[in-house]
């Protein structure tokens, strides 16, 4: 026979057991709480620092772009691509049609003040998108020039000039003194490029990379 | 670690914790039920507690000296 | 709802579930122990408590004095 336990020992044993179990419960709940807090606070700080970064990034642009239109890129809430509000977006770029008439150099300077360049057209799709926003009776400067007058055309952003991806009107370029390129509409050939004098005031198209925040 | 990744890791931890605890809870519940049935069947006999062969989780952590 | 928001909602649910289950489990554990002691007291002197082979969860954290 097993000797009988004293009632107070049994009480004490139960009390110890309860203490152990509830201690473990508290420890488990504390661990869960720590995990949960870390999950809530760290991302919050992460979001906060990300927001601070975004705000400082936005502040850079604010002087010339008081408002941006942003869209969420993909599924991730962190990645937003923005264009200044009056600008239109296509693929990874933003476009702005400037209706003020200015020389090529002044047009390029105006674009650069806005963090952009005169438009560099890399594909037929890009040109097709751009022309949707143009008026047929106007001409618009491109970011393409030949300052030396030796037919060494160059894009303002140093993109290599590729003869295979050009959309000159037939017979153009045709004048060594005409060192800047425009895009305009000709009824026979639709939209295409033409060389003109750089000092002649024209409308222009600015292009900038989307702002990622 | 990025914000969503951290959340997913925590999800996994909580999920596993939940599963383990659910299993333990169910197991304990079943044992209690079994013990109650056994107790009822053996109520004219001596043994009315939990089955002698029942081994709880973590049993091997410490070898307890059996009662003398 | 976006993907990250869903993750946080799931986190909260799992967190609450974990807490509730922890409490329930501990409560049940104590009930089992109490039941065992009660069963022992009612068994006219014969030891019919938990099996000598039975080791409870986490029991081993403290060396318990065996019943004399």
């Amino acid at each position: 026979m097993v000797p009988e336990e004293e009632p107070q020992d049994r009480e004490k044993g139960l009390w110890w057991f309860q203490l152990k179990v509830w201690s473990m419960a508290v420890v488990s709940i504390l661990l869960l709480s720590v995990c949960f807090t870390v999950s809530s606070v760290v991302p919050h700080n992460f979001m906060y620092s990300k927001t601070v970064k975004r705000l400082s990034k936005l502040r850079e642009y604010q002087q010339y772009h008081p408002s941006l239109t942003c869209v969420m890129e993909g599924k991730d809430i962190e990645d937003w691509s923005c264009c200044p509000t009056p600008w239109t977006s296509f693929q990874s770029s933003c476009y702005f049609i400037s209706t003020g008439m200015q020389s090529w150099t002044k047009s390029q300077k105006n674009c650069s003040v806005m963090g952009a360049d005169l438009v560099v057209i890399n594909t037929r799709e890009e040109q097709d998108f751009i022309i949707q926003n143009l008026k047929r009776n106007s001409s618009y400067f491109l970011g393409l020039s030949d300052p030396g007058g030796r037919r060494h055309w160059q894009w303002v952003d140093q993109t290599p000039y590729n003869e295979n991806v050009t959309f000159w009107h037939s017979g153009e370029p045709n004048n060594l003194d005409e060192r800047c390129a425009i895009i305009n509409f000709r009824s026979s050939e639709e939209w295409g490029w033409n060389d003109i004098h750089c000092h002649v005031p024209q409308k222009s198209i600015c292009k900038m990379k989307k702002i990622y925040i | 670690l990025g914000e969503p990744q951290l959340c997913y890791i925590l999800d996994a931890i909580l999920f596993l914790y939940g599963i383990v605890l659910t299993l333990l809870y169910c197991r304990l519940k079943i044992q209690v039920r079994k013990a109650a049935i056994t107790s009822y069947e053996k109520s004219d006999g001596v043994y009315t507690g939990l089955s002698t062969r029942n081994q709880e989780t973590y049993e091997t952590l410490k070898h307890e000296k059996p009662p003398q | 709802l976006g993907e990250p928001q869903l993750c946080y909602i799931l986190d909260a649910i799992l967190f609450l579930y974990g807490i509730v289950l922890t409490l329930l489990y501990c409560r049940l554990k104590i009930q089992v122990r109490k039941a065992a002691i009660t069963s022992y007291e009612k068994s006219d002197g014969v030891y019919t408590g938990l099996s000598t082979r039975n080791q409870e969860t986490y029991e081993t954290l403290k060396h318990e004095k065996p019943p004399q």
Partner: antibody, heavy 121, light 111 residues
């Protein structure tokens, strides 16, 4: 040798008209943009109008827009300035000048001797 | 329009001395490495004659004592050493955009 010779100046009443000519020689006239620049007595130089080499582009300052017309005849190596509705402030020596392009702009490398236009009643 | 302001309006220099004329534009007349300011000399009773193009390039046939410098809005024409035959009016001109404009002129006299 490059030569630019202006003609057609004279005395004219306010509201009257004159047509100035500039005969070019010694270079391929059709390859160059041309301009008219004037100088009022005792004053500085003032640009009056420009025409591109291919006749595709003409430009005027606001002071003469709608009154003056620049034109060229590449076959005759000649540059013209038709001046209508003349005013007293149009009194000046009128020079024709050849444009040379340099990067994104141009300068005037050769000038004629000038022809004098006097608008007076 | 781009306004060009020349200074001084007149200048008297002894032969062998240096004469410096400045031209300030109301806005930049440079684009990257191109500085689109030009200088002309006009002697009494004669048409203007090109001296310097592109801010610092000496036109062929112009004596090396003439030199030009500057960028953006501030440009300088230097005659060093000045000679008696340099008595004339000097004009700066820009044509980076239409209308092309001239400075008001600087009259250089030899003492």
């Amino acid at each position: 040798e490059v030569q630019l010779v202006e003609s057609g100046g004279g005395l004219v009443k306010p509201g009257g008209s004159l047509r100035l000519s500039c005969a070019a020689s010694g270079f391929t006239f059709s390859s160059y943009g041309m301009s008219w620049v004037r100088q009022a007595p005792g004053k500085g130089l003032e640009w009056v109008s420009t025409i591109s080499s291919g006749d595709s582009y003409t430009y005027y300052p606001d002071s003469v827009k709608g009154r003056f017309t620049i034109s060229r005849d590449n076959a005759k190596n000649s540059l013209y300035l038709q001046m209508n509705s003349l005013r007293a402030e149009d009194t000046a020596v009128y020079y024709c000048a050849r444009q040379i392009y340099y990067d994104y702009a141009y300068y005037f490398d050769f000038w004629g001797q000038g022809t004098t236009v006097t608008v007076s009643s | 329009d781009i306004v060009l302001t020349q200074s001084p309006a007149s200048l008297a220099v002894s032969p062998g001395q240096r004469a410096t004329i400045t031209c300030r534009a109301s806005e930049s007349v440079s684009f990257r490495t191109s500085h689109l300011m030009h200088w002309y000399q006009q002697k009494p009773g004669q048409p203007p004659k090109l001296l310097i193009y592109g801010a610092s390039n000496l036109e062929s046939g112009v004596p090396a004592r003439f030199s030009g410098s500057g960028s953006e809005t501030d440009f300088t024409l230097t005659i060093n050493p000045v000679e008696a035959e340099d008595t004339a009016n000097y004009y700066c001109q820009q044509s980076i955009e239409d209308p092309p404009t001239f400075g008001g002129g600087t009259k250089v006299e030899i003492k």
